[in-house]
C-alpha cells in the first residue's frame, strides 16, 4: 500500500489557446485530470488501473501552482494504491479549460482540452522527487512525482506491513525495510521476550520486563542461583531446593541436633579439654588447679591438702606454705622427729616403728588417711564422676549424682532407651542416636509392637487334597475342612487307609 504523488509546479500557455488552436474566452481557466496506470510501451487510452485524480481550476493561461499540501492537500496530488508497487507505471496528464463551474467530463465540450502529455517508465519507492518538464507546440508543464509507502508500509514495493508497538505482543519500531528493530531490553522474533538481568539463571530465573530476575519456586538470590533449603533447616545447606544437608557437627531432619557441642558452645573453661559424648552432652577434663563440671572453679593449692602430719596449709601468691606441728619438719611436714612412743597416730591409727625406731608409720583405720591418720578420706578429690556427674561424700563411700541421660557408678554409661523394655510382645529393641526402634515378632506391629495383627495361618496352604482352610483368629491357628473321602488334621489321609503310625 502506498501513494503516487504528483506535484504540479508550473503551466505555461502564453497564447491562451486550446489544443485545437482556438483561443479561450476570456482566458483558459485551467484544471488537470491525471490518469495513473500500469506500464504500457505505447501509452494508450483505457482504464486508469492505478487510479485517477482531478484538480479544481488552478489558474488562467500561464501560472505557477502553489504547494498546497498543508492546506487542502490538493498539491501534490495523491493517487493511493492498495497493492505491491510494481516499479513501473504509465502517467497521463491532461490540461482542460473549464468554461463554467461543472468540471465533470460529460459537462465539458470535447474541444475543451488544452494539452495532453503521456509518460511511462520505472519508478522506485523513495522520498526523492523526480522533476520533469513536457513541452508541446503551445504549452509547457513542469511537474515532479514520486512513490512513497502509506503509513505502516515498508520495503522496496510497499508490501511489508509493520506497526510499531510497545505491549506484551511486541516491543519494537520498524526499520525502512519493514523488519522489526527491538527496543532496548527486548529480544525474540517479535521482540516480545525480555532480556533478563545479566547472569540470571537460565532455568531457575525468568523475567517479565528487562533487567529483571524473578526466581522460580525453590530458588533465591539476585540471580536465582541459590536454592532455598527445607523450611526450618537450621544448620544445613542445599544443592537442590528443599534439601537440608547438615553442616559438620549437626544432625536430624532440620540439622538442629548438636552433635559437636564442644565446638559450637565451647563450654569448658580455663583451658580444659572438651570431649563430645553424644547429642548435646560433653565432658570437660580440667587442667590442674581447676574443678567443676565446666572446670569453672579455681582450686586453691591448699585444696589438695599437701601438708602432711597435721601441718596447716597457707595459700601464697606463688604457691603454698606448710606450718608443721611439733615433731615434724620439711616442705610438706613429711619428716618426723617423733617415734611411736609419742603416740603420733590419730583416729585409732596403729603405729609401726621403722629404721630401728628412728621413724614410724601409721596404719590408718578406714575413712582416715594422712601420715598420722589425721585426715578424713574425701573420695571426691579425684573427680571420678564422668559426663558432668556431681560427686557426693557418703560416709565411708562416695556416690555420683548423674546428669540426665547418664547412669552407672561413675555416670559413665549413656541411658539406653531400651533399658525400660519399651517393645511389647517380645519385640527386639534397637538403640538409635535419636531414640529407639522396635523389631516386632510375627503377628504384631506398631512403633512399640503394641498392635496385634492376625497371622493368616492359611497363607502357607497347610491343607491337602483340596480341603478348605480356615484361620482361627483367637489362636492364630488353622482348621482344615476335609472334602468327602479324606480325614486328618490336614486332610492328608484317604478314608479306609489307616495312617501308618511309627510306634
Amino acid at each position: 500500500s502506498g501513494v503516487f504523488q504528483l506535484q504540479l509546479q508550473e503551466f505555461i500557455n502564453e497564447r491562451g489557446v486550446l489544443a485545437s488552436g482556438r483561443p479561450c474566452e476570456p482566458g483558459c481557466r485551467t484544471f488537470f485530470r491525471v490518469c495513473l496506470k500500469h506500464f504500457q510501451a505505447v501509452v494508450s487510452p483505457g482504464p486508469c488501473t492505478f487510479g485517477t485524480v482531478s484538480t479544481p481550476v488552478l489558474g488562467t493561461n500561464s501560472f505557477a501552482v502553489r504547494d498546497d499540501s498543508s492546506g487542502g492537500g490538493r498539491n501534490p496530488l495523491q493517487l493511493p494504491f492498495n497493492f505491491t508497487w510494481p516499479g513501473t507505471f504509465s502517467l497521463i496528464i491532461e490540461a482542460w479549460h473549464a468554461p463554467g463551474d461543472d468540471l465533470r467530463p460529460e459537462a465539458l465540450p470535447p474541444d475543451a482540452l488544452i494539452s495532453k502529455i503521456a509518460i511511462q517508465g520505472s519508478l522506485a519507492v523513495g522520498q526523492n522527487w523526480l522533476l520533469d518538464e513536457q513541452t508541446s507546440t503551445l504549452t509547457r508543464l513542469r511537474y515532479s512525482y514520486r512513490v512513497i509507502c502509506s503509513d505502516n508500509y515498508y520495503g522496496d514495493n510497499c508490501s511489508r506491513l509493520c506497526k510499531k508497538r510497545n505491549d506484551h505482543f511486541g516491543h519494537y519500531v520498524c526499520q525502512p525495510d519493514g523488519n522489526l528493530s527491538c527496543l532496548p531490553g527486548w529480544t525474540g522474533e517479535y521482540c516480545q521476550q525480555p532480556i533478563c538481568l545479566s547472569g540470571c539463571h537460565e532455568q531457575n530465573g525468568y523475567c517479565s520486563k528487562p533487567a529483571e530476575c524473578l526466581c522460580r519456586p525453590g530458588w533465591q538470590g539476585r540471580l536465582c542461583n541459590e536454592c532455598i533449603p527445607h523450611n526450618g533447616c537450621r544448620h544445613g545447606t542445599c544443592s537442590t531446593p528443599w534439601q537440608c544437608t547438615c553442616d559438620e557437627g549437626w544432625g536430624g531432619l532440620f540439622c538442629d541436633q548438636d552433635l559437636n557441642y564442644c565446638t559450637h558452645h565451647s563450654p569448658c573453661k580455663n583451658g580444659a579439654t572438651c570431649s563430645n559424648s553424644g547429642q548435646r552432652s560433653y565432658t570437660c577434663t580440667c587442667r590442674p588447679g581447676y574443678t567443676g563440671v565446666d572446670c569453672e572453679l579455681e582450686l586453691s593449692e591448699c585444696d589438695s591438702n599437701p601438708c602432711r602430719n597435721g601441718g596447716s596449709c597457707k595459700d601464697q601468691e606463688d604457691g603454698y606454705h606448710c606450718l608443721c606441728p611439733p615433731g615434724y619438719y620439711g616442705l610438706h611436714c613429711e619428716h618426723s622427729t617423733l617415734s611411736c612412743a609419742d603416740s603420733p597416730c590419730f583416729n585409732g591409727g596403729s603405729c609401726r616403728e621403722r629404721n630401728q625406731g628412728a621413724n614410724y608409720a601409721c596404719e590408718c583405720p578406714p575413712n582416715f588417711t594422712g601420715s598420722n591418720c589425721e585426715k578424713k578420706v574425701d573420695r571426691c578429690t579425684s573427680n571420678p564422676c564422668a559426663n558432668g556427674g556431681q560427686c557426693l561424700n557418703r560416709g565411708p563411700s562416695r556416690m555420683c549424682r548423674c546428669r540426665p541421660g547418664f547412669t552407672g557408678t561413675y555416670c559413665e554409661l549413656h541411658v539406653s532407651d531400651c533399658a525400660r523394655n519399651p517393645c511389647a510382645h517380645g519385640g527386639t529393641c534397637h538403640d538409635l542416636e535419636n531414640g529407639l526402634m522396635c523389631t516386632c515378632p510375627a503377628g504384631f506391629s506398631g512403633r512399640r509392637c503394641e498392635v496385634r495383627t492376625s497371622i493368616d495361618a492359611c497363607a502357607s496352604s497347610p491343607c491337602f487334597n483340596r480341603a478348605t482352610c480356615y484361620t482361627d483368629l483367637s489362636t492364630d491357628t488353622f482348621v482344615c475342612n476335609c472334602p468327602y473321602g479324606f480325614v486328618g488334621s490336614r486332610c492328608e489321609f484317604p478314608v479306609g487307609l489307616p495312617p501308618s503310625f511309627p510306634w
Epitope: 506497526k163 508497538r165 505482543f169 521476550q193 523475567c207 517479565s208
Partner: antibody
Amino acid sequence: EVQLQESGPGLVKPSETLSLTCTVSGGSIRNSRYHWGWIRQPPGKGLEWIGDIYYTGSTYYNPSLKGRVTISVDTSKNQFSLKLSSVTAADTAVYYCAREDVILRGGSDYWGQGTLVTVSS
Amino acid sequence: SYELTQPPSVSVSPGQTASITCSGQRLGDKYASWYQQKPGQSPVLVIYEDSKRPSGIPERFSGSNSGDTATLTISGTQPMDEADYYCQAWDRDTGVFGYGTKVTVL
C-alpha cells in the same frame, strides 16, 4: 489440534470468588509464541477482554477489573486459571478461555466452548 | 479508556457485499482482528493483522485498516455468514473489543 476446555462452578453467590480453570490439550502452554487469555460475554451483550498470562507467569489485566481479577498458570498441568473476587450479578456471563498468538499480532485463533457462570444467591 | 465503535447492525442481500466498520482513535496504527460469532457458539477469528485470513476462512472475507477506521468486507455474502461480528485491537497491554455488529442476510 489444540483444544481449550473451561471448567468450574456454574453458580456463584454474590460477594464470593468466581474460580475457573482452562485446560489446554494438543499443545504446550510453555510455548513462547502464545499468551493465554480470558474473555467474557454477558447474556445478549458483547465480548469483554478480562486479562491474559504468559507461561512465565507475567499477567496483564483489564483496568476496569483490576484489583478483583487474578490469573495464574500451572505449566506442569498445562492449565491456567481465573479468579474474580467480590462478584455481583453484573459478572454473570459466558466465560471463554482463548489462545492469543504473537505471530497473529495478538489475534485469538483458538477458543474454549465457554462456560456460563451465574451470580445469584 | 480506548473504545472501538461498530454499527449495531448491517443488512445485506445474498450475493451482495457487506461492509462493517470499526472506528477508534488512530486505529490504523494498531493491528485489527475480526471475529465471527454465531448464536450459541464461540467466536471464530476471520481476519488478523488488518487484512490476513487464517486458513479455512473463505476468500470472500477481506479487511483493511487505515486512519481511524478498520473495515471488514464480505463480498458475495451467503446466508451462512449471518452472525455477530466483533473487531478487536490492543491498546498498550489491554485487549479491546468493539460492541459488535449483527449482520443479517435478507
